[in-house]
């Protein structure tokens, strides 16, 4: 999701912008940190096993807007969180995962019939 | 049009601090980052680090940090470079130049350092 | 930290001539999700500060004149000047910015025959 006052239709920033990278740092990063011209992000998603996983980094103004829409994916649990408003800016975001639906117990990626 | 202005010359001693200005005008400050970087005689040039005025974020090169602080004063739109104790080492020009993507499109005119007793 | 590596450290032409001067890179500056060229190249005349020429290896800054052509990728760049002019006197800096700390080669120093 967008951090309110985001607007939703992606523009050109003016100048580069830092954010703190996770599990999903470039080669370029240095101390954790990556550069870009859309946005900072941090997501929350199930790993196979169903263990919770975060990783932050940065998401090019390219695509980014649909990759910050949160869009649900079939049996998938994740959650994302985009923001440009300051360098570093996602450190403060804390999405979390959203509620099991009932479907989920059933044909979820760690349960098997 | 795009300027940065910076004094033209500093003396001071060995031992003591200096603080650098850059003054920038003819476009919004907060919208680029300032950077500093230091040019011995006859040498290359060195990057000492950058700042974002807009939330006053900072990079440093490791080999400076213990050297330089970097800030800034959104109302006058002018960044400044405090550097401590002072050797000869310092001594220098050191030039702030802008930048939106990480190369420097304007540069002030730079200040002479020279650190002496 | 990247090291950059410029050569020739001087050179002397008469005007009208071509000249080329390399730079060369410790590692890659060429971004695999846009493959852009991380390099700018600037010319500092004599008692002037530094002036950029051309940023992303080859895209010439505006107002630089067009016998200013920048070329390479990867880890070898090279400045060419069509046709030299007296007023090209000056010293050549390359500048990585693929990763911090930014760093600068050596210079090549052009003198006018």
């Known amino acids: 999701k967008k951090e309110d006052g985001e607007s939703t239709a992606p523009t050109a920033r003016p100048k580069v912008l830092r954010c703190k990278c996770h599990h999903h740092c470039p080669e370029d990063s240095v101390n954790n940190i990556c550069s870009t011209d859309g946005y900072c992000f941090t997501m929350i998603e199930e790993d196979d096993s169903g263990t919770p996983v975060v990783t932050s980094g940065c998401l090019g103004l390219e695509g980014s807007d649909f990759q910050c829409r949160d869009t649900p994916i079939p049996h998938q649990r994740r959650s994302i969180e985009c923001c440009t408003e300051r360098n570093e800016c996602n450190k403060d975001l804390h999405p979390t995962l959203p509620p099991l639906k009932d479907r989920d117990f059933v044909d979820g990626p760690i349960h098997h019939k | 049009q795009v300027q940065l202005q910076q004094p033209g010359a500093e003396l001071v001693m060995p031992g003591a601090s200096v603080k650098l200005s850059c003054k920038a005008s003819?476009?919004?400050?907060?919208?680029?980052?300032m950077h500093w970087v230091k040019q011995r005689p006859g040498q290359g040039l060195e990057w000492i680090g950058e700042?974002?005025?807009?939330?006053?974020?900072?990079t440093y090169n490791q080999k400076f940090k213990d050297k330089a602080t970097l800030t800034v004063d959104k109302s006058s739109s002018t960044a400044y470079m405090q550097l401590i104790n002072l050797t000869s080492e310092d001594s220098a020009v050191y030039y702030c130049?802008?930048?939106?993507?990480?190369?420097?499109?304007?540069w002030g005119q730079g200040t002479a350092l020279t650190v002496s007793s | 930290d990247i090291v950059m590596t410029q050569s020739p450290s001087s050179l002397a032409m008469s005007v009208g001539q071509k000249v080329t001067m390399s730079c060369k890179s410790s590692?890659?500056?060429?971004?695999?999700?846009?493959?852009?060229?991380?390099l700018a190249w600037y010319q500092q005349k004599p008692g002037q500060s530094p002036k950029l020429l051309v940023y992303?290896?080859?895209t010439r800054e505006s107002g630089v004149p067009d016998r200013f052509i920048g070329s390479g990728s990867g880890t070898d760049f090279t400045l060419t000047i069509s046709s030299v002019q007296a007023e090209d006197l000056a010293d050549y800096f390359c500048q990585q910015y693929y990763s911090t700390p930014w760093t600068f080669g050596g210079g090549t120093k052009l003198e006018i025959k």
């Open positions: 003819g476009y919004t400050f907060t919208n680029y980052w």
């Open positions: 992303f290896a080859s």
């Open positions: 130049a802008r930048s939106g993507w990480d190369y420097f499109d304007y």
């Open positions: 700042i974002d005025p807009s939330d006053v974020y900072t």
């Open positions: 590692q890659s500056l060429l971004k695999s999700n846009n493959q852009k060229n991380y």
